[in-house]
């Protein structure tokens, strides 16, 4: 008794296709090709066995809820167009939907609307007020802010990770020690090595030190100040210790010394 | 041309129940919906129960809402009435009809009724 789908319809029934967020209310229209003087207009839900469940109704001049308060019929001024809404929509409201009518005598008609099929999509954004639904989320800005704020935390600590790195590789760059020695006249470790400059360190004895001196840890460079220590004639060789008293008579350097660097 | 045929009538007692069943012959591929009235001895024929045959949309009079079921089956052609808690008031020549197109009414084509009778 399968008929084949019909080409017109007194009902119609749209939009064919709905999609709604969870807690949003979902419309359909209910449309009568012209209005009778007695009908019965039901809205229905398919069941998974193909079953129809009546949801409300209209009948003379009244509305007949259903078992569900949130299933809602309104007629609208033109008298030939129903409102059904579903209020606050649930995921399990997803489904099969049509309207029907039946034309009482004395010429009793029955009509069916196409079917139409509501999709009900979880909440993404912030829940509704008028309904219970999950833990609030946060919104999109709010989550733009958030994102942006610890993209920015990320970098800091990228680059501060940066910083120490190259100060570990690179320790004599970080404690700001000059390359002395003439550039004309590198000198190399083989034929293949490249240009390396040599400085030799006089080594200071603070005398009011109580303890030898530690080897200096690496730190970061607004932490460290640098004086320019001269020392005269030509520099001290590797190993020459230099009392602080020695520094006190420093003079200014001859061009032939570079200056150095070194952190107090 | 659609042929009708009632079958399940009989005589109950008031609170008891019945089946009636209608099945559908002939061109049955152009019905669009079927339906149940009734007449009792010196009224007119009343509405009881339509199905629309595609959607399985229901409807019912009121008299007999909640106590009264309608339902089809495609693959056997037939369409039901599942009758409880009857009274007396429910006797009557049962009448299956069949709507033959959207445009059509619940009343294109007529069974010969079954009659149903409730008495204590």
């Known amino acids: 008794l399968d008929s084949p789908d019909r080409p017109w319809s007194p009902l119609t029934f749209s939009p064919a296709q709905l999609t709604v967020q969870e807690g949003e209310n979902a419309t359909f229209t209910c449309s009568l090709a012209d209005i009778p003087d007695s009908f019965v207009l039901n809205w229905y839900r398919l069941s998974p066995r193909n079953q129809t469940d009546k949801l409300a109704a209209f009948q003379e001049d009244r509305i007949e809820p259903g078992r569900d308060r949130r299933f809602r019929v309104t007629r609208l001024p033109n008298g030939r167009d129903f409102h059904m809404s579903i209020v606050a929509a649930r995921l399990n409201d997803s489904g099969i939907y049509l309207c029907g009518a039946i034309y009482l005598p004395p010429n009793t008609q029955i009509n069916e609307s196409p079917r139409a099929e509501l999709s009900v999509t979880e909440r993404t954004l912030e829940p509704p007020t008028q309904s219970p639904s999950p833990p609030p989320r946060l919104s999109g800005q709010l989550q733009g802010l958030v994102i942006g704020v610890t993209s920015v935390l990320v970098g800091v600590l990228l680059l501060l990770l940066l910083t120490w790195v190259l100060a570990a590789v690179f320790p004599r760059a970080t404690r700001g020690a000059c390359v002395c020695g003439s550039e004309d006249e590198p000198l190399k470790e083989g034929p293949d090595a490249a240009p390396v400059f040599t400085l030799d360190y006089g080594e200071l004895d603070f005398q009011w030190r109580e303890k030898t001196p530690e080897p200096p840890a690496p730190c970061a460079p607004e932490q460290t100040e640098y004086a320019t220590i001269v020392f005269p004639g030509r520099p001290a060789s590797p190993g020459r210790r230099a009392s602080a008293s020695s520094l006190q008579g420093a003079q200014p350097p001859s061009p032939e010394d570079g200056p150095g660097l070194w952190p107090l | 041309e659609v042929q009708l045929v009632e079958s399940g009538g009989g005589e109950v007692k008031p609170g008891g129940s019945l089946r009636l069943s209608c099945v559908a012959s002939?061109?049955?591929?152009?019905?669009?919906?079927m339906g149940w009235f009734r007449q009792a001895p010196g009224k007119e024929r009343e509405f009881v129960a339509g199905i629309g045959w595609n959607g399985g949309t229901t409807y019912y009079a009121d008299a007999v809402k909640g106590r009264f079921t309608i339902s089809r089956d495609h693959a056997k052609n037939t369409v039901y009435l599942q009758m409880s808690s009857l009274r007396a008031e429910d006797t009557a020549v049962y009448y299956c009809?069949?709507?033959?197109?959207?445009?059509?009414?619940?009343?294109?084509?007529w069974g010969q009724g079954t009659q149903v009778t409730v008495k204590p």
């Open positions: 009809a069949a709507q033959e197109s959207a445009a059509g009414t619940l009343g294109d084509y």
């Open positions: 002939g061109r049955t591929v152009s019905i669009y919906a």
